[in-house]
């Protein structure tokens, strides 16, 4: 089942999923002055069995002036360094992408990628939140959020991170703890 | 069901002190945090400020900061707002929510009237 | 703290209007405001939150728009059960912080 929506943003802070259900897609965008090729894909899909989740289909784009096709390279750094869905600051570890069964790792960039990534995520998935720069976590609670199926409709959780700037958080007392893996997932809603 | 069930409504004298509750149930309780909120006779909503119940980390909202303590026990899923000398302004509707941003859920409220 | 300020203070209006509140950030909140709809001795009840998104549950008569420092809330086909006071809230910028409301009376 497909979640509804997009994960909720929160300010100050940018999501990322560590790994990917299995039933996610990722549609096949190329940056401008590219298209995808013409019995290209429209989308990479996380399938699996028991013991092995990965990416079918392949993402290919094309000059929109020619008709070469492209092959799989690594973007330049500067490339990565835009696609803002699928790429943060700095490392976030809350999870073992290889240890979670039924999901997929994040796909491997292809020629002429569009800057931002476009998932249709499922039900079950969590992203992880993360504060930008310049901000810091308020607490060290959890920084996720989980697509949840509630009365026959999906619904992001609300992630429990608030990310303040030093002058904001001047004026409240008590300690700063760091930001910490979830342990404590806020999660278990009931169901009807 | 995600429930937010309050205490009953209080009529005190000014000087004395107060608890109110905010028991919840349905949900990770001690994983959210719980928002307070004020709202004064015929006037508008206030944000008090918010508990992190799991290890009851507070934080106040600068109208409210050394007015009232805030608490919570993770235990028995319930987070408390309380007084140690009410004044005359104290009487209002507070309300505890399901936070941190918007508030999804609320409690019904406890009216607490502070009268000599 | 941000002010939030909300125009009208009350408005009148009869069933079947179609109703738009406004509300000022005093300064940029990027979408991050959350409307609220009250009844006289009830609780406030979310209805829109990131400016735009319906919460789940309420009618799609309401609609929530705008970014910057500037939102509406727009009920399409004023209803009985919609005359209440309303309120926005900015999370934008710790701690946040609630309009004073607009109060929506019959006609």
């Known amino acids: 089942e497909l979640c509804d929506d997009d994960p909720p943003e929160i300010p100050h802070a940018t999501f990322k999923a560590m790994a990917y259900k299995e039933g996610t897609m990722l549609n096949c965008e190329c940056k401008r002055g590219f298209r995808r090729i013409k019995s290209g894909s429209l989308y990479m899909l996380c399938t699996g069995n028991s013991s092995h989740s990965s990416w079918d289909n392949q993402c290919q784009c094309t000059s929109s002036a020619t008709r070469n096709t492209t092959k799989q390279v690594t973007p330049q750094p500067e490339e990565q360094k835009e696609r803002k869905t699928t790429e943060m600051q700095s490392p976030m570890q809350p999870v073992d992408q290889a240890s979670l069964p039924g999901h997929c790792r994040e796909p491997p960039p292809w020629e002429n990628e569009a800057t931002e990534r476009i998932y249709h995520f499922v039900v079950g998935q969590m992203v992880y939140y993360q504060c930008v720069q310049g901000y810091r976590a308020l607490h060290r609670g959890p920084a996720e959020s989980v697509c949840k199926m509630t009365h026959g409709k999906t619904r992001w959780t609300q992630p429990q991170l608030i990310c303040t700037g030093e002058m904001e958080t001047s004026q409240f007392p008590g300690e700063e703890k760091p930001q910490a893996s979830p342990e404590g997932r806020p999660e278990s809603e009931t169901s009807c | 069901e995600v429930q937010l069930v309050q205490s009953g409504a209080e009529v005190k004298k000014p000087g004395e002190s107060l608890k109110i509750s905010c028991k919840g149930s349905?949900?990770?309780?001690?994983?959210?945090?719980i928002v307070w909120v004020r709202q004064m006779p015929g006037k508008g909503l206030e944000w008090m400020g918010i508990?992190?119940?799991?290890?009851?980390?507070?934080r106040y909202s600068p109208s409210f900061q050394g007015q009232v303590t805030f608490s919570a026990d993770k235990s028995i899923s319930t987070a408390y707002l309380q007084w140690s000398s009410l004044k005359a302004s104290d009487t209002a509707m507070y309300y505890c929510t399901r936070g941190p941003y918007y508030s999804d859920y609320w409690g019904q409220g406890t009216l607490v009237t502070v009268s000599s | 703290d941000i002010q939030m300020t909300q125009s009208p203070s009350t408005l009148s209006a009869s069933v079947g209007d179609r109703v738009t509140i406004t509300c000022r950030a005093s300064?940029?909140?990027?979408?991050?405001l959350a409307w609220y709809q009250q009844k006289p001795g009830k609780a406030p009840k979310l209805l829109i939150y990131?400016?735009?998104s319906l919460e789940s549950g309420v009618p799609s008569r309401f609609s929530g728009s705008g970014s910057g420092a500037e939102f509406t809330l727009t009920i399409s086909s004023l209803q009985p059960d919609d005359f209440a006071t309303y309120y926005c809230q900015q999370y934008n910028s710790y701690t946040w912080t609630f309009g004073q409301g607009t109060k929506v009376e019959i006609k």
């Open positions: 300064q940029i909140i990027s979408g991050y």
């Open positions: 990131k400016a735009s």
């Open positions: 508990i992190y119940p799991d290890d009851s980390e507070t």
């Open positions: 349905g949900y990770s309780f001690a994983n959210y945090w």
